[in-house]
């Protein structure tokens, strides 16, 4: 709880925000968790704390570890944890998966690729953009503020895009790079009001207390790649990410499949170590697109162990 993964490359700037929500202007103390050593606030240090931000200028592989931040108030301190990993620079062009930020999708009508984490940095335009390590050139590519716009997107534009910018701290410049995948969606086809294939409406799923359980929300939205379509789970009307129960997680990313030419998505809800109180929750499978939203509700019931007779 209150933990966040952050990563960067050695000799680049890395800035991490305290995962625990506070408000601007509150005192935030940072510690290196393994030693409980306080992180200094003086900017002359290579690693220093600046309010809600922890700055590695530049980062070193040895900086990897868990950092604790405490948002201070006289009546209620709030603690968060930043799990920081600094990697060695790769000699080849390949960007490993562990350095990739979330994938974004684009289409002919919408082809913005945002540079991840850039809002944490003090940077000035223009951004430099690379695709598969090659600098992007030509009038089709426009670096605008913190994102890249590609005109007349084609299937060949799919790939890994890296943004590179300079962070300035008290007159000193530090390089930062961030990479994410871009996929191109086919505009042809049509979309329908979502059809949920599973679970059935008001389905009762039997689970065993103490065991793990999976619920799959699966829906189809039309033919071809869909501009806006999503399936997700809610608990008692609240998003899984906001519900705050670490045992209950949605599978990261949505699996896309084409069933009889239809575009379908599924999202798996994983419940670890099922507890009695999980049986009291309402599990909603939501499927939504531009046409609207459809909801199927599932409840859990206890599965009685089967008697084994000879």
């Amino acid at each position: 709880k209150f933990s966040k993964q952050s990563w960067g490359l050695e000799n680049e700037a890395l800035i991490v925000r305290c995962p625990r929500q506070g408000k601007p202007s509150y005192t935030v103390d940072w510690y290196y968790s393994q030693t409980n050593k306080s992180i200094p606030t003086q900017e002359r240090n290579r690693v220093f704390a600046s309010g809600q931000l922890l700055k590695f200028l530049p980062a070193a592989v040895a900086d990897s570890g868990i950092y604790t931040c405490i948002v201070r108030s006289p009546t209620f301190n709030r603690t968060g944890y930043a799990n920081v990993t600094i990697y060695k620079k790769q000699s080849d062009c390949n960007v490993p998966d562990y350095l990739m930020y979330s994938t974004v999708s684009g289409s002919e009508k919408n082809s913005k690729i945002y540079c991840p984490t850039i809002d944490l940095y003090n940077w000035t335009a223009p951004l430099e953009w690379f695709k598969n390590c090659q600098a992007l050139q030509g009038s089709r590519y426009r670096a605008h503020k913190s994102f890249l716009v590609i005109d007349n997107v084609m299937t060949e534009d799919a790939g890994d895009y890296t943004c590179k910018f300079i962070h300035n701290e008290n007159g000193a410049n530090y390089s930062v790079t961030a990479t994410r995948s871009f996929t191109v969606k086919d505009e042809q086809g049509f979309s329908l009001f979502p059809v949920i294939g599973a679970p059935a409406q008001n389905e009762i799923k039997e689970v065993e207390i103490g065991k793990n359980a999976n619920l799959t929300c699966s829906a189809c939205f039309g033919k071809g790649t869909q501009f806006l379509a999503a399936v997700l789970w809610q608990l008692n009307g609240t998003k899984i990410t906001d519900f705050g129960e670490p045992r209950i997680q949605q599978e990261e990313g949505q699996n896309q499949s084409f069933s009889n030419g239809l575009a379908c998505l599924d999202m798996v809800l994983r419940i670890a170590d099922v507890k009695e109180e999980d049986l009291l929750l309402q599990y909603d499978c939501l499927a939504l697109n531009l046409h609207g939203l459809r909801r199927h509700t599932v409840r859990l019931s206890r599965k009685n162990p089967i008697d084994h007779h000879s």
């Epitope: 108030s73 006289p74 209620f76 709030r78």
Partner: antibody
Amino acid sequence: QVQLQESGPGLVKPSQTLSLTCTVSGYSITSDYAWNWIRQPPGKGLEWIGYIDYSGSTTYNPSLKSRVTISRDTSKNQFSLKLSSVTAADTAVYYCASTVIDSMDYWGQGTLVTVSS
Amino acid sequence: DIVLTQSPASLAVSPGQRATITCRASKSVSTSGHSYMHWYQQKPGQPPKLLIYLASNLESGVPARFSGSGSGTDFTLTINPVEANDAANYYCQHSREFPFTFGQGTKVEIK
């Protein structure tokens, strides 16, 4: 966006227990924050009653502590107020509110509770 | 308990003018470089709305016409320039220790 909604009886008899519930949407009460009850007698100022934080820990105003219980139902994403042995002085608009840190950031619309026989 | 005393109890201001409300605490609400004083606006029939936190920080979405200042025991909320829809009750609140307490309120009327 966090949204809060108070509910409960609008009329309570003297010496009985006042019970109110605050339903939270848009955020899980176990994720973070402190979840407060505040009251405001008609035409008067605000009085902080107490809170329950995301972990279930409670803190009460000492002036009401002997009569107050704040609890929660995580399965319904609700927290509740019970105030025992009420008198006419407990007539007020009761608000629930959330605290990110220190200040009351989001408020419910409030519900008027009248103590009368 | 820390007692917060607001003054004046009410004031009438013309649009475009400055309104100043003060809040005095019975003991200091400042520590470790911060002042744990917050200001709220309450219009009739509505819940209070946070305007200023930590004495001088404007809450997100609140117009820059509102500002706060002060430290220790003496704090000020300023509205400049006042607009017609600023007619409301204004409350200060501290969070220096438990219990949190509020001022008795200041009613701002627009002439």
